[in-house]
Interface confidence: low
């Protein structure tokens, strides 16, 4: 069965749910925890053995319009002498987030949810070595 | 998507702000990307600042499963495979947006929620405070 039969609805208070047209959902974009802030250690992007830079992408038809992406500065990692060690690899760490995309169709506008992959920083890893026979 | 008529005359001026409430299509673009970090890479084991991944599940949220990283050590793994306490493993945190069912249990009414997740760990030089 595609949808559970009446009496087996998963939702405990369907009468209190707002009516929504088929094929869509109602989304309040007033963000819960809007003022929450990241409490990361200071300047870790510069102090890391796999340092990274940040760039901001901006799109007025996306909510939120600003998305910050990290890029690893080096292929290798920074050793104790401050030099790049290419026997190790700086690799990006990624995380998915949701955004709302606004699309214009003639004089109408529609909204679509989209998963976006954000690079949040870099870590230093031992490389995988493939031995050729 | 679900189309919403614009102002009469369809002016060229772009609406700078998104409306507080929008109707969105149920189909999420890129929804089928791999969301399990254990399957997408083994960086959490190969890193000099390795981490464990903890699964957090909440059916009132989309996505219902989110993975949280916890650094395994205070220090970092050196070339000999030992923990070097002259360096620090620190979590990389990121704010992400998820959907929260609002009112609770409603099938197709959501609100955006900002949550803070630790995505992985990185090895950093410590900040040394010299006492005068």
């Amino acid at each position: 069965r595609k949808i559970p039969k009446v009496g087996h609805t998963f939702f405990q208070k369907p009468e209190s749910c707002p009516p929504v047209p088929g094929g869509s959902m109602k989304l309040d974009i007033g963000i819960i925890n809007e003022n929450q802030r990241v409490s990361m250690s200071r300047n870790i992007e510069s102090r890391s053995t796999s340092p990274w830079n940040y760039t901001v992408t901006w799109d007025p038809n996306r909510y939120p319009s600003e998305v910050v992406q990290a890029q690893c500065r080096n292929l290798g990692c920074i050793n104790a002498q401050g030099k790049e060690d290419i026997s190790m690899n700086s690799v990006p760490i990624q995380q998915e987030t949701l955004v709302v995309r606004r699309k214009h169709q003639g004089c109408s506008v529609s909204f679509q949810l989209e998963k976006v992959l954000v690079t949040v920083g870099c870590t230093c890893v031992t490389p995988v070595i493939h031995h050729v026979q | 998507g679900i189309t919403i008529p614009r102002n009469p005359g369809c002016p060229n001026s772009e609406d700078k702000n998104f409306p507080r409430t929008v109707m969105v299509n149920l189909n999420i673009h890129n929804r089928n990307t791999n969301t399990n970090p254990k399957r997408s890479s083994d960086y959490y084991n190969r890193s000099t600042s390795p981490w464990n991944l903890h699964r957090n599940e909440d059916p009132e949220r989309y996505p219902s499963v989110i993975w949280e990283a916890k650094c395994r050590h205070l220090g970092c793994i050196n070339a000999d495979g030992n923990v070097d306490y002259h360096m620090n493993s620190v979590p990389i945190q990121q704010e992400i947006l998820v959907l929260r069912r609002e009112p609770p249990h409603c099938p197709n009414s959501f609100r955006l929620e900002k949550i803070l997740v630790s995505v992985g760990c990185t090895c950093v030089t410590p900040i040394v405070h010299h006492v005068a």
Epitope: K2, F10 | R55, P59, Y62, P107, N108
Partner: nanobody, 119 residues
Framework: EVQLVESGGGLVQPGGSLRLSCAAS????????MYWVRQAPGKGLEWVAS????????YYVDSVKGRFTISRDNAKKSLFLQMNSLRAEDTAVYYC????????????WGQGTLVTVSS
């Protein structure tokens, strides 16, 4: 056609045990997260437990943690729920469910198996 068929329910005394099974067909079982949900008399459905595609991770609602164990056998396309230390409040129809979809939690359900815990 997708089918989920539960079995193993019945009448059991408080403190007793039951093992529920769910036989799946019509889809690639090993590709989906699977769930057990339950509906107590006169109540809405409650999510009970879930298990990842490869069985590597399980998750439980607080009220059953330490008493229930979810498992799966991908080769046999089967989902299981081992229920120990059963309580009267565990009385419900138990359903297995497949996947996650917006806006619903689950896109396919079984017909359910009744578990009654009573002395």
């Amino acid at each position: 056609e997708v089918q989920l068929v539960e079995s193993g329910g019945g009448l059991v005394q408080p403190g007793g045990s039951l093992r529920l099974s769910c036989a799946a067909s019509g889809f690639t079982f090993s590709s989906y997260r699977m769930y057990w949900v339950r509906q107590a008399p006169g109540k809405g459905l409650e999510w009970v437990a879930s298990i990842e595609q490869d069985g590597s991770e399980e998750y439980y609602v607080d009220s059953v943690k330490g008493r229930f164990t979810i498992s799966r056998d991908n080769a046999k396309k089967s989902l299981f729920l081992q229920m120990n230390s059963l309580r009267a409040e565990d009385t419900a129809v138990y359903y297995c469910a497949k996947g996650e979809i917006l806006p619903l939690y689950f896109d396919y359900w079984g017909q359910g198996t009744l578990v009654t815990v009573s002395s």
